[in-house]
Structure formats: structure tokens, C-alpha cells
């Protein structure tokens, strides 16, 4: 199922089919009898209810408001209302560039490193069933590719691959021919220098715990996009049902690298969890860094120097 239109501000190009899908769609099916209304407001007009009689270009289906096609005068605010649920979008329809196969303001930019995997797939899931054919253009010159339903480029990037790639889907609706264009500006760059991934904090951590309680071991690293962070521990003795790895959390740093953290959760700590190594590793194609955690019973704390302790 096509996801709903959650972006509140949308820019589209005149002359193309376009749709808005509200985000309480599953709810709308449950309450079929509830009144569902679409409204538009722009400049002089306040909240005009939309229906197929408003314009021959507008179609309403369950959760979707369709434009066949969208035109400059469709610019404005749109509202979907159902009971106490309201969703609002601000739609800006821009002029098509008549001298090019794409409109510069509607281009998605992508940076690809040379020799890295480079892929463009022409897909449009919402209009999929109506699409007769799809063409892929590079700098407005048609590329001859085998598949005319979903043309695809899959290769290792070369500098000559740089350019504007436009997927143009041709579709029929009510006897008229329409097209939808999606353009990518592909820039090919030199290999970006990778950092040596590093785990944050001390390499050996003794963690004071109580039997029967839970503990969360947090492992954080600074790494490259393709590097990985994972836990390894004594599973040779069989899987411990009390040990759970949480999903990795990852945020980008201002320098374009990544800060990742992965938590190992140990529930209902038992004797078998004490004095064994729980190893967290960050790995890249260039090497690894590992830090270890050892769970120690609180009563035994006195035996360990204070500087190796984490709480």
C-alpha cells in the first residue's frame, strides 16, 4: 500500500497527475459511515468543499484526492476532515520548464562515490497499474534499456555517469495521455576519506550488578556509513534467553560521519552472567576496535580498583 502524504508542504509541477493521501486511512475504512470531506482554501476563497463536480480534473477515492492533472490554479491549502481528525497540506504548483525534459526545482540530488554501487530504478507504486511504459533519460537523451516498464541502471559509478537522470512514466486515464517525471541530479565524487572507526569510552568496563536485576550495556562508536557495530559474548554455551540486543541507533555528525550506539540488555541477571566477557566490536574493511564489559556482583566491588568501574 502506498504511504500517506505526511509532508505538510508540497511542491509539484503543473500538468502532471498528482494525489494527496490522508494519514488516517486505515481508520477511515473502519468508520465507513463517517462523513469525510476534502476542502481547499486559497487567497480569496475560504474552505471550499471539493467534489468531482468542482472540477473534471479532481477524483476522490476512499483516502485519496487525485488531480488529473494538477494545474497552477490548484495552488493553495488543502484539508481532509473526518469527525475530529483534520490533516492539512500546503500545495505549491510550479510552472513546467517547456525547454527541458525536467523542471530544475523538482530535482533530487544524489552524491555517489566513484567505483561505489550506483543505482537508478524508475518506479511509481501509486500509478503502477496505469503506467503503459516508462523511459529513462540522461541529460534529456533517452537511454536504450531492456525493461520499458521499470528501466533500471545498476553499476559501479564512473565519472562519466554524472548528470541528470529523468524517469518519465507514461499513463492513460479517461482516454487522455499523461506523464510523470522524476529527476535525479547525480554527482560523482572521489572516494571520500574514511575515518578509522573507534569505540567511545574505556576498553574494559566492570559493571556492578545485583542478581535478579537488569542491566543495559551501552556501546557507542564513531564510524563510517558502511561500518558495523555488534555484540559478541559466550553464546557457545547455548543462547541465553535473558540477553537481548536492541536495534542500533545512528545519527549523522556534522562532518558526515556516523555516531552509532547499540545496547545489550541483560534481564534477571544470574550467576552465569557474572565474570564473563561481553564484547562490543566496531568493524570496517580497514580493521576493528573492541571493548569489553564484565558484570561483577556489587558485593565484590571492593576487590576492583575504582578507576576501572562504570555504573
Amino acid at each position: 500500500a502506498e504511504s500517506c502524504t505526511s509532508r505538510p508542504h508540497i511542491t509539484v509541477v503543473e500538468g502532471e497527475p498528482f494525489y494527496l493521501k490522508h494519514c488516517s486511512c486505515s481508520l477511515a475504512h473502519e468508520i465507513e459511515t463517517t462523513t469525510k470531506s476534502w476542502y481547499k482554501s486559497s487567497g480569496s476563497q475560504e474552505h471550499v468543499e471539493l467534489n468531482p463536480r468542482s472540477s473534471s480534473r479532481i477524483a476522490l477515492h476512499d483516502c485519496v484526492l487525485e488531480f488529473w492533472p494538477v494545474e497552477l490554479n490548484d495552488t493553495g491549502s488543502y484539508f481532509f476532515q473526518m469527525k475530529n481528525y483534520t490533516q492539512k497540506w500546503k500545495l505549491n504548483v510550479i510552472r513546467r520548464n517547456k525547454h527541458s525534459c525536467f523542471t530544475e526545482r523538482q530535482v533530487t540530488s544524489k552524491i555517489v562515490e566513484v567505483k561505489k554501487f550506483f543505482q537508478i530504478t524508475c518506479e511509481n507504486s501509486y500509478y503502477q497499474t496505469l503506467v503503459n511504459s516508462t523511459s529513462l533519460y540522461k541529460n534529456c537523451k533517452k537511454l536504450l534499456l531492456e525493461n520499458n516498464k521499470n528501466p533500471t541502471i545498476k553499476k559501479n559509478a564512473e565519472f562519466e555517469d554524472q548528470g541528470y537522470y529523468s524517469c518519465v512514466h507514461f499513463l492513460h486515464h479517461n482516454g487522455k495521455l499523461f506523464n510523470i517525471t522524476k529527476t535525479f541530479n547525480i554527482t560523482i565524487v572521489e572516494d571520500r576519506s574514511n575515518i578509522v572507526p573507534v569505540l567511545l569510552g574505556p576498553k574494559l568496563n566492570h559493571v556492578a550488578v545485583e542478581l535478579g536485576k537488569n542491566v543495559r550495556l551501552n556501546c557507542s562508536a564513531l564510524l563510517n556509513e558502511e561500518d558495523v557495530i555488534y555484540w559478541m559474548f559466550g553464546e557457545e554455551n547455548g543462547s541465553d534467553p535473558n540477553i537481548h540486543e536492541e536495534k542500533e541507533m545512528r545519527i549523522m555528525t556534522p562532518e558526515g560521519k556516523w555516531h552509532a550506539s547499540k545496547v545489550l540488555r541483560i534481564e534477571n541477571i544470574g550467576e552465569s552472567n557474572l565474570n564473563v566477557l561481553y564484547n562490543c566490536t566496531v568493524a570496517s574493511t580497514g580493521g576493528t576496535d573492541t571493548k569489553s564489559f564484565i558484570l561483577v556482583r556489587k558485593a565484590d566491588m571492593a576487590d576492583i580498583p575504582g578507576h576501572v568501574f562504570t555504573r
Partner: nanobody
Framework: DVPLQESGGGLVQPGQSLRLSCAAS????????MGWFQQAPGKGRDLIAR???????YYTDSVKGRFTISKDNAKNTLYLQMNSLNLEDTGVYYC?????????WGQGTQVTVSS
């Protein structure tokens, strides 16, 4: 020559199965701990299953009881049998070695679970 080549992905409905393969050229996998990683859209690569040189296996909670990792040392190939697939299993799947520097990544294989 790509050192790791994943294959076997596809579009399936919830509850269905897939078997992924990872053919390793170059270094033999028999001496390495090998793992399968899942990369959901916009996320990092999460290790979901691994197998030691001796054949001991480990799975994360999200796949335990549904996925099975195995390897064929003679064919230098790692496998992931995925049963009872659900929507959260959607992503690109990669294999790689653990416990040392990673091999160069393959292109991965896309698994899409959709109703």
C-alpha cells in the same frame, strides 16, 4: 571480482519464506565467524545471525525461531533460510565476516515483505 555476492531476495507476502545465499570468492569462510546483516531503509546494518567456524549459531530476538543460518564450506557459501517473514523483515541483506576486518561489502539482496 566482488568478494561477497548475496542473492535470493525478492518480494513476498507475510508468512512466506526465502532462502538467501552469499557466495564468497577469495578468502575461505570456514575459518571465519560469518554473519548476516539486515539494513532497513535509512538505518545502519544490524547483525541478525552469525555462525562460528565450528558451526555454533546465534540469532537476535527478532529472527529467533524463524531464520536459520548455515554454511557450505566446500562451496564457500553462507545461507540464510527465512521463514514466517513479516513486514519488519523488509530491507537489504548483506553477509560479512566477524571478529576481524570486514570483507568488502557485496551489493546486498533486497527482501520486501508486503501484503
Amino acid at each position: 571480482d566482488v568478494p561477497l555476492q548475496e542473492s535470493g531476495g525478492g518480494l513476498v507476502q507475510p508468512g512466506q519464506s526465502l532462502r538467501l545465499s552469499c557466495a564468497a570468492s577469495g578468502s575461505p569462510i570456514r575459518f571465519s565467524v560469518m554473519g548476516w546483516f539486515q539494513q532497513a531503509p535509512g538505518k545502519g546494518r544490524d547483525l541478525i545471525a552469525r555462525i562460528t567456524s565450528g558451526g555454533i549459531v546465534y540469532y537476535t530476538d527478532s529472527v529467533k525461531g524463524r531464520f536459520t543460518i548455515s554454511k557450505d564450506n566446500a562451496k564457500n557459501t553462507l545461507y540464510l533460510q527465512m521463514n514466517s517473514l513479516n513486514l519488519e523483515d523488509t530491507g537489504v541483506y548483506y553477509c560479512n565476516r566477524l571478529g576481524g576486518a570486514l570483507f568488502d561489502w557485496g551489493q546486498g539482496t533486497q527482501v520486501t515483505v508486503s501484503s
